[in-house]
């Protein structure tokens, strides 16, 4: 029950739509038993998929409140999924929903290997040995959830760059264009482990995003959602590096786990960018190899998807 009890509407946000979503969450929490973990996960993701597909009065909230709601949903979802997945039996689970929400989850006894979770628009690779806190006897869980609908609530969310990156960008680019807000290129994804201490991973996690086309000469950034003190948040790049990007895919490497996305910032790239090499048909052969390898994994990988839906 503790998993659900803290996931309630954010204070100060008045939305009928959001209230109904959290009513459903609380109902699921009340009825929850460990044997229902699989069904409960599906019901929560179904409810979230439907919420973000038809956000109703959420889209009439001021932008900042929308960002607070998104932050609250991402944070709570990660906690709830982590808690519930500890009651799943070993194996790989894939769920997908009509509006695009997707969950890939692997539960194992701790093993010394890397794990790859593949989805329609994202691939995640990391070492298994980071999934569990040392001394924790339970199973290890690695999860990845893609939430394309979250982009509606994160429109115009600010990007806060580290001072060093900011300086480097201003040296190599004409500077931020006037309208300022970066464009969300990819789905928003959230990655989690049974170990909730993921602020400083011993070896980095790699994400490969499939996304909308990049506008030529625009800056592509791998970002994560940093939950602010005020319960809201912003996009940030600390601990995340953009390994390479092509027209419709980008590889990111991060030293922590959170919610991630690929943004296109409004910079006009003047020349070759030392922060990020944009891969073209010519050079960058090492990165080309990574892309080719990822492409093969993408098509060979899989695991079936399960559609689960109801009314209401």
């Amino acid at each position: 029950d503790m998993t659900f009890s803290t996931w309630t509407p954010p204070p100060g946000v008045h939305s009928q739509t959001l209230s109904r979503f959290f009513d459903k969450v609380q109902d699921l929490g009340r009825d929850y038993k460990p044997g229902l973990a699989n069904n409960t996960i599906q019901s929560i993701l179904q409810a979230l998929d439907e919420l973000l597909e038809a956000p109703g009065d959420l889209e009439t909230l001021p932008r900042l409140q929308q960002h607070c709601v998104a932050s609250h949903l991402l944070d709570g979802l990660e906690d709830v999924l982590r808690g519930l997945s500890k009651n799943l039996s070993n194996g790989l689970l894939n769920f997908s929903y009509p509006a695009g929400t997707e969950l890939s989850l692997e539960v194992q006894k701790q093993v010394d290997r890397s794990v790859t979770l593949r989805q329609n628009q994202a691939v995640m690779q990391l070492d298994w040995n980071q999934a569990q806190k040392s001394g924790d006897p339970g199973p290890s869980v690695v999860g990845l959830v893609s939430i394309p609908g979250m982009g509606k609530l994160l429109a115009e969310a600010p990007l806060v760059l580290e001072p060093e990156k900011q300086m480097l960008l201003h040296e190599t680019h004409q500077g931020l264009l006037q309208d300022g807000s970066p464009i969300l290129l990819s789905d928003v994804i959230s990655a989690f482990l049974s170990n909730n201490d993921t602020q400083n991973l011993s070896s980095p996690v790699t994400f490969t995003f499939s996304h909308r086309s990049v506008i030529p000469r625009q800056k592509v950034l791998c970002v994560f959602w940093e939950h602010g003190q005020n319960g809201c948040g912003h996009w940030a790049t600390t601990g995340c590096s953009t390994i390479g990007t092509r027209d419709t895919s980008t590889i990111c490497r991060c030293t922590h786990l959170s919610s991630f996305a690929v943004l296109m910032a409004h910079y006009d790239v003047q020349e070759e960018d030392p922060v990020l090499t944009v891969i073209t048909g010519g050079g960058g052969s090492g990165l080309n190899d990574i892309f080719e390898a990822q492409k093969i994994e993408w098509h060979e990988g899989g695991g079936g998807s399960h559609h689960h839906h109801h009314h209401g």
Epitope: Q16, T17, R20, F21, D23, K24, D49, E50, L51, E53, A54, P55, G56, D57, L58, E59, T60, P98, A99, G100, H309, H310, H311, G312
Partner: antibody, heavy 118, light 112 residues
Framework: EVQLVQSGGGLVKPGGSLRLSCVAS????????MNWVRQAPGKGLEWVSS????????YYADSVKGRFTISRDNAKNSLYLQMDSLRAEDTAVYYC???????????WGQGTLVTVSS | QSVLTQPPSVFAAPGEKVTISCSGS????????VSWYQQLPGTAPKLLIY???KRPSGIPDRFSGSKSGTSATLGITGLQTGDEADYYC????????????FGTGTKVTVLG
């Protein structure tokens, strides 16, 4: 002010087709699920079909499944119901209605009469 | 073929209180919120009560709703001639291939 304005009703022969339209104003159309509900003369209300904001979720009542098609054009703030293979029992006033997530039909169109008769 | 059952008609004098019952099952009323709709003669239905007991803005507090288990009730106090209409309960049904279900409808007649 939320408004749903309907058109497209009329008299049609059994087996024929008709397309109903509903144009919305006064709210963010793309944020809401939309529905069609009908009412046969002198009878009660019957839910017909539902479509979510981006058309990811579409549902039909068993009585119209395979014959009716719901669709929407968010750029035009419009909802449609394509009715094929019409039968006498489809004769009714058809209403479009807005629905909030997990909630009721909070706004209704004025209704349009569809008469199926030879 | 409605799955929510309402009394066909209710009669009362102006100023009186009337209640309309709506009976369902665990897959509809027992599983979701109930709404009530008012349909004045020759007009489209209008939302009267939602989420079992909430009133949209503009609906007077003479109208109230409640739910217990698999049945719901609409109450109208201080009945007025303008309340003469058909009233329908409604909810989502989670049983296979079902969608939104309405009650059979109740005709409220204001006497005198």
């Amino acid at each position: 002010e939320v408004q749903l304005v309907q058109s497209g009703g009329g008299l049609v022969k059994p087996g024929g087709s008709l397309r109903l339209s509903c144009v919305a104003s006064g709210f963010i159309f793309r944020s809401y699920s939309m529905n069609w509900v009908r009412q046969a003369p002198g009878k009660g209300l019957e839910w017909v079909s539902s479509i979510s904001s981006s058309s990811s979720y579409i549902y039909y009542a068993d009585s119209v499944k395979g014959r009716f098609t719901i669709s929407r054009d968010n750029a035009k703030n419009s909802l449609y119901l394509q009715m094929d293979s019409l039968r006498a029992e489809d004769t009714a006033v058809y209403y479009c209605a807005r629905r909030e997530y997990g909630g009721p039909f909070d706004y209704w169109g004025q209704g349009t009469l569809v008469t199926v008769s030879s | 073929q409605s799955v929510l059952t309402q009394p066909p008609s209710v009669f009362a004098a102006p100023g009186e209180k009337v209640t309309i019952s709506c009976s369902g099952s665990s897959s509809n009323i027992g599983n979701d919120y109930v709404s009530w709709y008012q349909q004045l003669p020759g007009t489209a239905p209008k939302l009267l009560i939602y989420d079992n007991n909430k009133r949209p803005s503009g609906i007077p507090d003479r109208f109230s709703g409640s739910k217990s288990g698999t049945s719901a009730t609409l109450g109208i106090t201080g009945l007025q001639t303008g309340d003469e209409a058909d009233y329908y309960c409604g909810t989502w049904d989670s049983s296979l291939s079902a969608g939104y279900v309405f009650g059979t409808g109740t005709k409220v007649t204001v006497l005198g």
